[in-house]
């Protein structure tokens, strides 16, 4: 679709004649008749398939002819086609004496024509003006013509429709030969598609508008290029979506289970070293110099009663020092200087003659010890406590204190590590020397039965188009990674590409 | 050829929901060169465009109908579905499910059979 | 809001030409489609993009748009032709119908 268009300049008849020669009376009232039709070799009369348009009067014998285009009159005149422009035309001209005011042809007496020109051409699409004269014995016409598209036509021959558009079928205006123009931010064939934020990952975001990013499920951050784990995964980490892969030192299925209390907690004081004996359970070894189940208590080196025969301890930086009392001597006040005739043994303790008197032994009743009787008996010292327990003396009697995994009056117990019910989904557990065992069911394993192996829900293959499977072990169910170019909850349709679909 | 279907209740109380689905076979939802509308005539009225829904979740709607409106695309299913709010006798129509086409202009060059909804107590 | 105009009723003889307006503020510059509907059915698209046909719709039909004015025109008109037919064009992000024409 397009205008042929004919401007009319200057047209000079200086004796008023008309093409019979015979003059206008009183001069020749001139209006023109166009008439354009296809290419012809030569141009001849018959009907104008491209168009024809009249002018009213334009003027008397010689005139110029005034660009009337701006006030909306009628030059340039306007021919318009709704048919691709062929290139080549074909024009004719004539110019009438119009001696009253009906211009119509049957109106005009056949010797009312002054002139009339026929030219035909190539003519193609442009906005530039082609300016032509023609001149005959007696008149002189001047004129410029052009071809250009309708609004919203482009191309060489004015063929192609467009039109510019901000909408959800398409963000583009049109470039001269018709073709879309994306505005920024939007691409695809008809500029429907947004160009999502710079880095968007091209598998796992997609943006409905530009310099967006929309993560698809599994995945997350700015640039959906993280992947998101699995529910409730405390201590784990991801490589692709609902994985739960636990940091060092911990374990299960949501890396909740704490297989390193020692590193994550320091529960050892006083410099001792930390032990993992399990989930949740450790021992320590403590220095010289400390006890506790933490090595928080600080032992004092006189607490063993290291001085015989009633001598008395002190601490010292580097160890104790035993003062013994008369009669004896040596690093513990082990030897004596006694005899039974000195009454050595205290608490009714009865004294024996050895060596041939150069030296005793007391026998003490009972509640008492020590080599002259001298002390009361600590129910600790034979280390009653089995199993690491510490003893704690408490008045006349004794008790212990039992390392974890013990019990009993003398920790000689050993607590069943399965009291916790620890092995999961129905596993039955088995006490051992040093721990436990689980025996899982058919569909998980690990060390606890945390790991469920049966119920794999891709192992079916179910996503298509070379997508990555992904088992949701909470639920038993899949979720497909669709690789670029693919959706759908099996990544089974495909995206942007002509579909394979008989319509 | 793709062929369009809608499903739901003919009729609906006032002040309720109307939730409609179209299921589309013969061709994929989540091709790029397609919106999936709703279209409703009420008896003996002309046709009222409701909106559309491009397989990635954009939506599109009526201003007139759009405080109402929820429109939502399921590609797993080849699905998606109306759901109007506070309905009143107004809204009974038959309403139809479109594929309208970038390629066309927006052009809706597929049509379900419609199905009428009925707004009554 | 936006609004198409189109005339309630076109009455044509059998082999006669209908003529079928839609008008709009500035619908020259919008694309815009016709449907064809029969009673009791789903509408149908005759035209698209002004002018375009769909494949299977009769050369009979036409379209054109500009101005303000867009023209559905039957040439030859059929009996089967009589149905109504509604014009539809997109302003900024929804789709607008006209009010229908019945053509007798």
């Known amino acids: 679709s397009g205008v042929f268009q004919l401007q009319l300049q200057e047209f000079i008849n200086e004796r008023g004649v008309l093409a019979s020669g015979r003059p206008c009376e009183p001069g020749c009232r001139t209006f023109f008749r166009v008439c354009l039709k296809h290419f012809q070799a030569v141009v001849s009369p018959g009907p104008c398939t491209f168009g024809t348009v009249s002018t009213p009067v334009l003027g008397t014998n010689s005139f110029a002819v005034r660009d009337d285009s701006s006030g909306g009159g009628r030059n340039p005149l306007q021919l318009p086609f709704n048919f691709t422009w062929p290139g080549t035309f074909s024009l004719i001209i004539e110019a009438w004496h119009a001696p009253g005011d009906d211009l119509r042809p049957e109106a005009l007496p056949p010797d009312a024509l002054i002139s009339k020109i026929a030219i035909q051409g190539s003519l193609a699409v442009g906005q530039n003006w082609l300016l032509d004269e023609q001149t005959s014995t007696l008149t002189r016409l001047r004129y410029s013509y052009r071809v250009i598209c309708s609004d919203n036509y482009y191309g060489d021959n004015c063929s192609r429709l467009c039109k510019k558009r901000n909408d959800h079928f398409g963000h583009y205006v049109c470039q001269p030969d018709g073709n879309l123009s994306c505005l920024p931010g939007w691409t695809g064939e008809y500029c429907q598609q947004p160009i999502c934020l710079s880095g968007c990952h091209e598998q796992n975001g997609y943006c409905s508008k530009p310099a967006e990013c929309l993560c698809r499920p599994g995945w997350q951050g700015r640039l959906c290029n993280e992947c998101i784990p699995h529910n409730g995964c405390r201590h784990g980490t991801c490589s692709t979506p609902w994985q739960c892969t636990c940091d060092e030192g911990w374990g299960g299925l949501f890396c909740d289970q704490d297989l390193n209390y020692c590193t994550h907690h320091s529960p050892c004081k006083n410099g001792a070293t930390c032990s993992n004996s399990g989930q949740r359970s450790y021992t320590c070894t403590c220095r010289p110099g400390y006890t506790g189940v933490d090595c928080e208590l600080e032992l004092s080196e006189c607490d063993s009663n290291p001085c015989r025969n009633g001598g008395s301890c002190k601490d010292q930086e580097d160890g104790y020092h035993c003062l013994c009392p008369p009669g004896y001597y040596g690093l513990h006040c082990e030897h004596s200087t006694l005899s039974c005739a000195d009454s050595p043994c205290f608490n009714g303790g009865s004294c024996r003659e050895r060596n041939q008197g150069a030296n005793y032994a007391c026998e003490c009743p009972p509640n008492f010890t020590g080599s002259n009787c001298e002390k009361k008996v600590d129910r600790c010292t034979s280390n009653p406590c089995a199993n690491g327990g510490q003893c704690l003396n408490r008045g006349p009697s004794r008790m212990c204190r039992c390392r974890p995994g013990f019990t009993g009056t003398y920790c000689e117990l050993h607590v069943s590590d399965c009291a916790r019910n620890p092995c999961a989904h129905g596993g039955t557990c088995h006490d051992l020397e040093n721990g436990l065992m689980c025996t899982c069911p058919a569909g998980f394993s690990g060390r606890r039965c945390e790991v469920r192996t049966s119920i794999d829900a891709c192992a079916s293959s179910p996503c298509f188009n070379r997508a990555t499977c992904y088992t949701d072990l909470s639920t038993d169910t899949f979720v497909c990674n669709c690789p670029y170019g693919f959706v759908g909850s099996r990544c089974e349709f495909p995206v942007g590409l002509p579909p394979s679909f008989p319509w | 050829e793709v062929q369009l279907q809608e499903s739901g209740p003919g009729l609906v109380k006032p002040s309720e929901t109307l939730s409609l689905t179209c299921t589309v076979s013969?061709?994929?939802?989540?091709?790029?060169?397609?919106?999936w509308g709703w279209i409703r005539q009420p008896p003996g009225k002309g046709l009222e465009w409701i909106g559309d829904?491009?397989?990635?979740?954009?939506?599109y709607y009526n201003p007139s109908l759009k405080s109402r409106v929820t429109i939502s695309v399921d590609t797993s299913k080849n699905q998606f579905s109306l759901k109007l709010s506070s309905v009143t006798a107004a809204d009974t129509a038959v309403y139809y499910c479109?594929?309208?086409?970038?390629?066309f202009g927006g052009g809706a060059d597929s049509w379900g059979q419609g199905t009428l909804v009925t707004v009554s107590s | 809001s936006y609004e198409l105009t189109q005339p309630p009723s076109v009455s044509v003889s059998p082999g006669q030409t209908a003529s079928i307006t839609c008008s709009g503020d500035g619908l020259g510059d919008k694309y815009v489609s016709w449907y064809q509907q029969k009673p009791g059915q789903s509408p149908v698209l005759v035209i698209y993009e002004d002018s375009t046909r769909p494949s299977g719709i009769p050369e009979r039909f036409s379209g054109s748009n500009s101005g303000d004015t867009a023209t559905l025109t039957i040439s030859g008109t059929q009996p089967m032709d009589e149905a109504d037919y509604y014009c539809?064009?997109?302003?900024?992000?929804?789709?607008?119908f006209g009010s229908g024409t019945k053509v007798t």
């Open positions: 539809q064009a997109w302003d900024s992000e929804s789709g607008v």
């Open positions: 479109a594929r309208e086409a970038v390629s």
């Open positions: 829904i491009y397989y990635t979740g954009s939506t």
């Open positions: 013969g061709g994929s939802i989540s091709s790029s060169n397609y919106y």
